[in-house]
Interface confidence: low
């Protein structure tokens, strides 16, 4: 099964050869190249020097070699960086090559979403409802879930909005929101909303946003 | 069988630019890198750079890069050098060279072109 | 840039002499070293490729040695035919430079 490796965008994913070297060969006699799952080439470094025929325009400049982990860097992560990873080591004869080592990875690329935001996009109406939307932008993958967490001094109420989300066409990041309509007929207390975005490893949470009710006025003395 | 046909001599004046072709044929265009070799009158060979047809990656010689652009044509298998801002001493036989396969270990330019002559006169 | 330094520049030998050209890189380059042979008015031909092995249908009498810095062309016995100009090439890094060419003539 290939490595899995997880690394973040627009940072660097160490793709590792995990070459034992028990012939302790210099690299002076190697070909090593990592290729990704289309078969092109990101990398090659023929008998200690790293050579760019090969190398795919996508990758050109993007790429350093660690001759002491026998670690491939890619900079400059982007989610279609995402897949399988070959590195290929072949010891170099006149005649042609001889492969001795293969090494797979996996590559996820993560990106963290900003922390959601609530904006108010009516005013209270007679305290009777709100409509607020939550958003997050900049993330991968989707998130599993966006949801409204409503607290007064005496309840917590979740609301499960429709999750809305667009995608990045270039950087393929996500941007998510849900839009709410909250209603708090018998509310006479002050209320804090939250929002909350779910990934698979992280849950978010926004900054609190509070709603400050106006108390309900006492009747006016009633003088017989 | 593997060939490179390369465009006609050429005649130019110093400062115009020239654009010799080299067309393959008898191997896949694209699985193979195109070198560019000159040789002036009476000279030795100097290599001005490679295109890769498949990734259309280039790699000029420093002392052409700014003159030099090397192009290709995958509907036609065919390769361009185009020398701009010519000047006298770029008079030359252009060779274009086809490179063996990268993963059997061969960098050698194993098939060339017939070369073309460029002539640089005001 | 690797240089790469041949001599002689020009040789005279006859028909059925053993003759050894040789070229000097200034730096290490393995073995990444390539002869060819250029006859006038025609594009060079590969001889030998990876310092010391024939390309194929060069004849036998042909040789080439050396690694590293120093590098051998032999021609183990003259032939008509062999009278040209030679040059070796390397190509471990760009930009790939060749020697300046050594010139084979009849004596």
């Known amino acids: 099964a290939p490595l899995k490796i997880q690394a973040y965008f627009n940072e660097t994913a160490d793709l590792p050869c995990q070459f034992a070297n028990s012939q302790n060969q210099s690299l002076s006699e190697l070909v090593v190249f990592w290729q990704d799952q289309e078969n092109l080439v990101l990398n090659e470094v023929y008998l200690g020097k790293e050579k760019f025929d090969s190398v795919h325009s996508k990758y050109m400049g993007r790429t350093s070699f660690d001759s002491d982990s026998w670690t491939l860097r890619l900079h400059n992560l982007q989610i279609k960086d995402k897949g399988l990873y070959q590195c290929i080591i072949h010891h170099k004869k006149p005649t042609g090559m001889i492969r001795i080592h293969q090494m797979n990875s996996e590559l996820s690329v993560l990106a963290n979403f900003s922390q959601p935001e609530i904006v108010p996009i009516s005013n209270i109406t007679e305290n009777v409802y709100i409509n607020l939307t939550c958003s997050s932008i900049h993330g991968y993958p989707e998130p599993k879930k966006m949801s409204v967490l409503l607290r007064t001094k005496n309840s917590t109420i979740e609301y499960d909005g429709v999750m809305q989300k667009s995608q990045d066409n270039v950087t393929e990041l996500y941007d998510v929101s849900i839009s709410l309509s909250v209603s708090f007929p018998d509310v006479t207390s002050n209320m804090t909303i939250f929002c909350i975005l779910e990934t698979d490893k992280t849950r978010l949470l926004s900054s609190p946003f509070s709603i400050e009710l106006e108390d309900p006025q006492p009747p006016p003395d009633h003088i017989p | 069988q593997v060939q490179l046909v390369q465009s006609g001599a050429e005649v130019k004046k110093p400062g115009a630019s020239v654009k010799v072709s080299c067309k393959a044929s008898?191997?896949?265009?694209?699985?193979?890198?195109i070198h560019w070799v000159r040789q002036a009158p009476g000279q030795g060979l100097e290599w001005m750079g490679y295109i890769n047809p498949y990734h259309d990656v280039t790699k000029y010689n420093e002392k052409f890069q700014g003159r030099v652009t090397m192009t290709r044509d995958t509907s036609t298998s065919t390769v361009y050098m185009e020398l701009s801002s010519l000047r006298s001493e770029d008079t030359a036989v252009y060779y274009c060279a086809r490179q063996g396969d990268p993963y059997s270990g061969n960098y050698q330019f194993t098939y060339w072109g017939q070369g073309t002559l460029v002539t640089v006169s005001s | 840039d690797i240089q790469m330094t041949q001599s002689p520049s020009s040789l005279s030998a006859s028909v059925g002499d053993r003759v050894t050209i040789t070229c000097r890189a200034s730096?290490?380059?393995?073995?990444?070293v390539v002869w060819y042979q250029q006859k006038p008015g025609k594009a060079p031909k590969l001889l030998i490729y990876s310092a010391s092995y024939r390309y194929s249908g060069v004849p036998s009498r042909f040789s080439g040695s050396g690694s590293g810095t120093d590098f051998t062309l032999t021609i183990s016995s003259l032939q008509p035919e062999d009278f040209a100009t030679y040059y070796c090439?390397?190509?471990?890094?760009?930009?790939?430079?060749f020697g300046q060419g050594t010139k084979l003539e009849i004596k």
């Open positions: 008898g191997y896949t265009f694209t699985s193979y890198v």
């Open positions: 730096q290490d380059v393995s073995t990444e």
């Open positions: 090439q390397q190509h471990y890094s760009t930009p790939y430079t």
